[in-house]
């Protein structure tokens, strides 16, 4: 029983349980394909426990392997709409530091209006994740349609 | 080595490893959009460790942040079928207690026959999750095509 | 503080944190629908911590419940291409030992060019997972478009 007590007394941070789930705040200005995220209990069911937001982008605070997941739904979209607009693509990647810049996850919408995926990837303290949406259809801001999150899995 | 032994002796429940993976049992009656789930080793590869089923809906037994995931495939479906029966939408939400009712995850099929997604969300003991399928196409009951699960991630 | 120290000193393997993320190496010969995977830091961001590769297929080393996830993108694909080459299907299953052979996860591309999904499933030491792609379109080998992974979740 001593172990269970010790576990409860330890701060969760020491167990490396960093986790975040974000909702869409807004899209970027004209030449900026990035999505800008927000999180926190005042906003609904989004949260940040460990990672932080830096100008709407997610910054990692603990080295480790993470499960990264995302869903983006295009607003006012049908398969017809999607086919009549420039191909829409979503890419999640490390955008800073520049030396570690890489695309982690990429999906095209084709004739669909939602993409959803997830992957395991090593991330390091200070890595900032960016989600780039290219295309001419606006992403939905509904919190059950568009969200982005990470979960620390192991060192 | 004492720690490893202690860990093995502790019931998993004390580590908060609640997890469930369910397979489709049946759809609801005429005016009920809910999918009804079932789980247990006798049924194949579905299981419940912590959460419980309440009349085919998943009830949470431990507070925490959970990864919720789902895949639903429409039966006897092609992109032509899907577009002719549009819109078919799947929503996962907390349906009880009523005071906590909220949609957590929503996807439309558009011209596709399968949706799959996942998200992190806080859930509380007693929350019941419902999966509502609106549309006129039946979901497949194949266990590798339609499934629904949750995994406790952290307090 | 003793617990935290002990936790750090214990090999991660004793915590059961088996995890792997693989990238596509190549497709199989004519009559072999399997995808052949590769992983390791020399290849980029793929890795194996616990599970092993056996002739390009993933072999499990620890009993438990795993989160299995996959994304496969078809190369040189548009919704028109996809619909003209229908049906392309991806199935993830246990392919050996033969006594445990079963399909765990199945998706069709229909008019899309990417499938992505995930599920929880019990796996046993020695289980080998195969990913079968049927159809006439080649999968992309881009590491941000096609990947396959598992994460040990609990015993």
């Amino acid at each position: 029983q001593r172990f269970a007590q010790a576990q409860q007394q330890l701060p969760l941070e020491s167990l490396g349980w960093d986790v975040a789930e974000l909702q869409l705040n807004h899209t970027g200005p004209q030449q900026d394909p990035r999505l800008y995220w927000q999180g926190g209990p005042a906003l609904g069911r989004s949260f940040l426990h460990g990672p932080e937001l830096d100008k709407g982008q997610l910054r990692i605070h603990r080295d480790g392997i993470y499960m990264v997941h995302i869903q983006v739904t295009l607003a006012i979209c049908s398969s017809t709409t999607a086919s009549r607009h420039h191909p829409t693509t979503l890419a999640v990647g490390i955008c800073s530091p520049a030396s570690r810049s890489i695309s982690l996850l990429r999906l095209s919408f084709h004739q669909g209006c939602t993409i959803a995926s997830q992957r395991l990837t090593p991330l390091a303290r200070g890595d900032t994740l960016c989600t780039n949406l290219t295309g001419t259809l606006l992403p939905s801001r509904n919190t059950d349609e568009t969200f982005f999150g990470v979960q620390w899995v192991r060192p | 080595q004492r720690f490893a032994q202690a860990q093995q002796q502790l019931p998993l429940e004390s580590l908060g490893w609640d997890v469930a993976e369910l397979q489709l049992n049946h759809t609801g009656p005429q005016q009920d959009p809910r999918l009804y789930w079932q789980g247990g080793p006798a049924l194949g590869r579905s299981f419940l460790h912590g959460p419980e089923l309440d009349k085919g809906q998943l009830r949470i037994h431990r507070d925490g942040i959970y990864m919720v995931h789902i895949q639903v495939t429409l039966a006897i479906c092609s992109s032509t079928t899907a577009s002719r029966h549009h819109p078919t939408t799947l929503a996962v939400g907390i349906c009880s207690p009523a005071s906590r009712s909220i949609s957590l995850l929503r996807l439309s099929f558009h011209q596709g026959c399968t949706i799959a997604s996942q998200r992190l969300t806080p859930l509380a003991r007693g929350d019941t999750l419902c999966t509502n399928l609106t549309g006129t196409l039946l979901p497949s009951r194949n266990t590798d095509e339609t499934f629904f699960g949750v995994q406790w991630v952290r307090p | 503080q003793r617990f935290a120290q002990a936790q750090q000193q214990l090999p991660l393997e004793s915590l059961g944190w088996d995890v792997a993320e693989l990238q596509l190496n190549h497709t199989g010969p004519q009559q072999d629908p399997r995808l052949y995977w590769q992983g390791g830091p020399a290849l980029g961001r793929s890795f194996l911590h616990g599970p092993e590769l056996d002739k390009g297929q993933l072999r499990i080393h620890r009993d438990g419940i795993y989160m299995v996830h996959i994304q496969v993108t078809l190369a040189i694909c548009s919704s028109t291409t996809a619909s003209r080459h229908h049906p392309t299907t991806l199935a993830v299953g246990i392919c050996s030992p033969a006594s445990r052979s079963i399909s765990l996860l199945r998706l069709s591309f229909h008019q899309g060019c990417t499938i992505a999904s995930q599920r929880l499933t019990p796996l046993a030491r020695g289980d080998t997972l195969c990913t079968n792609l049927t159809g006439t379109l080649l999968p992309s080998r881009n590491t941000d478009e096609t990947f396959f992974g598992v994460q040990w979740v609990r015993p």
């Epitope: 899209t27 607003a75 006012i76 420039h86 001419t136 606006l138 | - | -």
Partner: antibody, heavy 119, light 111 residues
Framework: EVQLVQSGAEVKKPGASVKVSCKAS????????IHWVRQAPGQGLEWMGD????????SYNQKFRDRVTMTRDTSTSTVYMELSSLRSEDTAVYYC????????????WGQGTLVTVSS | DIVMSQSPDSLAVSLGERATINCRAS??????????MHWYQQKPGQPPKLLIY???NLESGVPDRFSGSGSGTNFTLTISSLQAEDVAVYYC?????????FGGGTKVEIK
């Protein structure tokens, strides 16, 4: 700099057809839908439809569906709007317009083409 | 089709005073976390100029005396301090669904 340059004014007889062009420059032509909006003298604005230059797919306002055709020529980065069976009430300034990043609102406009329908 | 009703038809305001234009949609133009309402200014012999998009976002280069508000069916364009160069006709437009439709316009003049 994004520019939309339209063809010159036209005078047409009732029952005839008119084809107005809109030449785009300063951006990747196939990326952005081009919309057409008309304005009768002293009246408000009326959306006619749009075309996606990437594949030529067009969507029309039901009001004009039987009479309007939108096409594009990717080699010259030009979009065309043809209106047939002209009547006097089609007398208007016809504008092509483009959105900035996301579709739905128009940040860039052509200078307008006056089409006069008169017997 | 969604019908857009603008009021008033015309408005005379003193220089430096506030001008308020209203636009009502026949049904809600808000969905997916946005209000699909946009405002334009048009001067004689010129094409319309985008002022406000998605109900409240100021288009680049537009003076900040222009602002937009509202959601659902009721929207407002406000000019906080009218300048001589603001004399024009102002139109609202929705993009909630096809066909897009415009309001009938409001003519703003100096009193």
């Amino acid at each position: 700099e994004v520019q939309l340059v339209q063809s010159g004014a036209e005078v047409k007889k009732p029952g005839a057809s008119v084809k107005v062009s809109c030449k785009a420059s300063g951006y990747t032509f196939t990326t952005y839908n081009i919309h057409w909006v008309r304005q009768a003298p002293g009246q408000g604005l009326e959306w006619m439809g749009d075309i996606y230059p990437g594949n030529g797919d067009a969507s029309y306002n039901q009001k004009f569906r039987d009479r309007v055709t939108m096409t594009r020529d990717t080699s010259t980065s030009t979009v065309y709007m043809e209106l047939s069976s002209l009547r006097s009430e089609d007398t208007a300034v016809y504008y092509c317009a483009r959105f900035s990043r996301f579709d739905g609102w128009f940040a860039y406009w052509g200078q307008g083409t006056l089409v006069t329908v008169s017997s | 089709d969604i019908v857009m009703s603008q009021s008033p038809d015309s408005l005379a305001v003193s220089l430096g005073e506030r001008a308020t234009i209203n636009c009502r949609a026949s049904r809600s133009v808000s969905t997916s976390g946005y209000s699909y309402m946009h405002w334009y200014q048009q001067k004689p012999g010129q094409p319309p100029k985008l002022l406000i998009y998605l109900a409240s976002n100021l288009e680049s280069g537009v003076p900040d005396r222009f602002s937009g508000s509202g959601s659902g069916t009721n929207f407002t364009l406000t000019i906080s301090s009218l300048q001589a160069e603001d004399v024009a006709v102002y139109y609202c437009q929705h993009s909630r669904e096809l066909p897009y439709t415009f309001g009938g316009g409001t003519k703003v003049e100096i009193k």
